[in-house]
């Protein structure tokens, strides 16, 4: 499928609107500090060049790869060295090393100001004044803050963002209409970003085989009626799409994702009975819908797995002939029978099966050796089941905020070297597993909870990788992708940690806390809780609870006071002294 001009090919496939949007996302994800106007200028230049190639594919430079064209364009940025430091060294390299270099400099936690939402009337005026610029700004601001956001999905978010403004800016109560929609998009966007970040980490840190194994398990759960060959084809295509997006090849990624959606809809009879509604939607909605589609019903009367994978005399022969195909079939057969298991559990089972075959197929009596392999699965299945049961009970007892606090204490004690903002962010997200998953019946709890926890722990891993401070975090993050959660669960209090020096400034609060939203106020209190544990890692739950209750009462009291600032100053000193005494600081 060779084209004389790759840039012309993609422009013709995607159209100018999508071409420009995707190039903007790509550039903003690479050069995260560049001003909006600079990116728009670069995008317009690339687009005009692409149009000359559409008109004549033999024109000068039209035969160059997209990486070469885009990299050359990024390297024209005058302030590259002063804004990005050593990233400027990438420009001295040749492709493909130059693109790899840009990828390595993507920053998961860029030093960018928090996005402040303007007044609704201000936003509506900006929207009406120039819809095109308004949408481009949205793409730019999200892409630079989320450098691995799944680009074709970001187009879908932008479409919904636009629809919200179109509807709400003509509503009687604009704010009541718009703000909940924007909140929903923000929350969904953060979740989408984190899910895609795990896919990219899986591909980049653990390789294509790891991603394909994940995809086989997930697609087999979702499409249990599909044949193994069909699932394998979907896995191959999906791997290509995500490899491209994670590699910064956003035009190819969006194009291939559209092709995959088209294929799935044309072949839905042999894939899933649940796709009908999705396939009636326009492209972006269709692709999103397919990605989120519910699991199809399992075929009736599926035979026991043991026959082919334990009892058969041909197990070692089949394994030796094509190891990954045989393991893929095992994973497919197990996953389609177990929509009640998390993907990571299914992958642990497949790994155990593989390890057993590696050992047993070299033994004197292979069959005797692997006959009890399924017995080894029992503890692997029970461990997440028990963990989820215990934590859901705790969540139901405490509610989300206090459940988050319990996790904050737990994780700060495990890895106290990790920065406080990271511990707060990650523990808050871990705590959301309760409201997200505990409401589900037993059969849906594990896939919801453990696969969500994989996404959240990956956030910890990528943030920690930027500035590594804990060998224990590094170990859990790098040893095994599927065992990250059990690895973190197994960590006990870090006995080697030297408690942090007490600093009264950390526990000094001001009247500005009173005007914060409930969420922001929670974050302030949770930040203080982490700092408290860092000072006194051996503090008991009861001690910490007492201090936090006093702290909550102190904030409530001073926020009701006439002279708030004086109250915070005077009562704050008393609280610090009382807390020090209570904790023996």
């Amino acid at each position: 499928d060779a084209h004389k001009s790759e840039v012309a090919h993609r422009f013709k496939d995607l159209g100018e609107e999508n071409f420009k949007a995707l190039v903007l996302i790509a550039f903003a994800q690479y050069l995260q500090q560049c001003p909006f106007e600079d990116h728009v200028k670069l995008v317009n230049e690339v687009t005009e060049f692409a149009k000359t190639c559409v008109a004549d594919e033999s024109a000068e430079n039209c035969d160059k790869s997209l990486h070469t064209l885009f990299g050359d364009k990024l390297c024209t940025v005058a302030t590259l060295r002063e804004t990005y430091g050593e990233m400027a060294d990438c420009c001295a390299k040749q492709e493909p090393e130059r693109n790899e270099c840009f990828l390595q400099h993507k920053d998961d936690n860029p030093n960018l100001p928090r996005l402040v939402r303007p007044e609704v009337d201000v936003m509506c005026t900006a929207f009406h004044d120039n819809e095109e610029t308004f949408l481009k700004k949205y793409l730019y601001e999200i892409a630079r803050r989320h450098p691995y956001f799944y680009a074709p999905e970001l187009l879908f978010f932008a479409k919904r963002y636009k629809a919200a403004f179109t509807e709400c800016c003509q509503a009687a109560d604009k704010a009541a209409c718009l703000l909940p929609k924007l909140d929903e998009l923000r929350d969904e966007g953060k979740a989408s970003s984190a899910k895609q970040r795990l896919k990219c980490a899986s591909l980049q840190k653990f390789g294509e085989r790891a991603f394909k194994a994940w995809a086989v398990a997930r697609l087999s759960q979702r499409f249990p009626k599909a044949e193994f060959a069909e699932v394998s084809k979907l896995v191959t295509d999906l791997t290509k799409v995500h490899t491209e997006c994670c590699h910064g090849d956003l035009l190819e990624c969006a194009d291939d994702r559209a092709d995959l959606a088209k294929y799935i809809c044309e072949n839905q009879d042999s894939i899933s009975s649940k796709l009908k509604e999705c396939c009636e939607k326009p492209l972006l909605e269709k692709s999103h819908c397919i990605a989120e589609v519910e699991n199809d019903e399992m075929p009736a009367d599926l035979p026991s797995l043991a026959a082919d994978f334990v009892e058969s005399k041909d197990v070692c022969k089949n394994y030796a002939e094509a190891k990954d195909v045989f393991l893929g079939m095992f994973l497919y057969e197990y996953a389609r029978r177990h929509p009640d298991y998390s993907v990571v559990l299914l992958l642990r089972l497949a790994k155990t099966y593989e390890t057993t075959l590696e050992k047993c197929c070299a033994a004197a009596d292979p069959h005797e050796c692997y006959a009890k392999v399924f017995d080894e699965f029992k503890p692997l299945v029970e461990e997440p089941q028990n963990l989820i049961k215990q934590n859901c009970e705790l969540f139901e007892q405490l509610g989300e905020y206090k459940f988050q606090n319990a996790l904050l204490v737990r994780y700060t004690k495990k890895v106290p070297q990790v920065s406080t903002p990271t511990l707060v962010e990650v523990s808050r997200n871990l705590g959301k597993v309760g409201s997200k998953c505990c409401k589900h019946p037993e059969a849906k709890r594990m896939p919801c909870a453990e696969d969500y926890l994989s996404v959240v722990l990956n956030q910890l891993c990528v943030l920690h990788e930027k500035t590594p401070v804990s060998d224990r975090v590094t170990k859990c993050c790098t040893e095994s992708l599927v065992n990250r959660r059990p690895c973190f669960s197994a960590l006990e209090v870090d006995e080697t940690y030297v408690p942090k020096e007490f600093n009264a400034e950390t526990f000094t609060f001001h009247a500005d806390i009173c005007t914060l939203s409930e969420k922001e106020r929670q974050i302030k209190k949770q930040t203080a809780l982490v700092e408290l544990v860092k000072h006194k890692p051996k503090a008991t739950k009861e001690q910490l609870k007492a201090v936090m209750d006093d702290f909550a009462a102190f904030v409530e009291k001073c926020c009701k006071a006439d002279d708030k600032e004086t109250c915070f100053a005077e009562e704050g000193k008393k609280l610090v002294a009382a807390s020090q005494a209570a904790l023996g600081l």
Epitope: K12, G15, E17, P282
Partner: nanobody, 130 residues
Framework: HVQLVESGGGLVQAGGSLRLSCAAS???????RAWFRQAPGKEREFVAA????????YYTDSVKGRFTISRDDAKNTVYLQMNSLKPEDTAVYYC????????????????????????WGQGTQVTVSS
Amino acid sequence: HVQLVESGGGLVQAGGSLRLSCAASDTIDNYARAWFRQAPGKEREFVAAITWTFGTPYYTDSVKGRFTISRDDAKNTVYLQMNSLKPEDTAVYYCAASLYLPVRTASGGYRLDTDRPQYWGQGTQVTVSS
């Protein structure tokens, strides 16, 4: 081959309204849809366009504020709501599908050259009497 079919044209008095429709025979997700018009003895000119992904509208200066372009994803159809019609709006109105977007003019309106669209409809007559 994609076919574009226009409907909704007719005779209307000045100040009146008409709504044109353009249905596509097939999904062409990545193409902007546009309306052009050609008055007797004049060249075909751009009127309005809407992008397919985000639904961003573009208008030529002379119709801004009077005409509204919209789309229905599910029906694969584009509409041109024409209000406050003037005799100078009399023309054959053509629907088109274009990979390219309109470009901004110095006056702040938009234009799209007639060589840009990949697909054209047959046209529908709009006559505005004074």
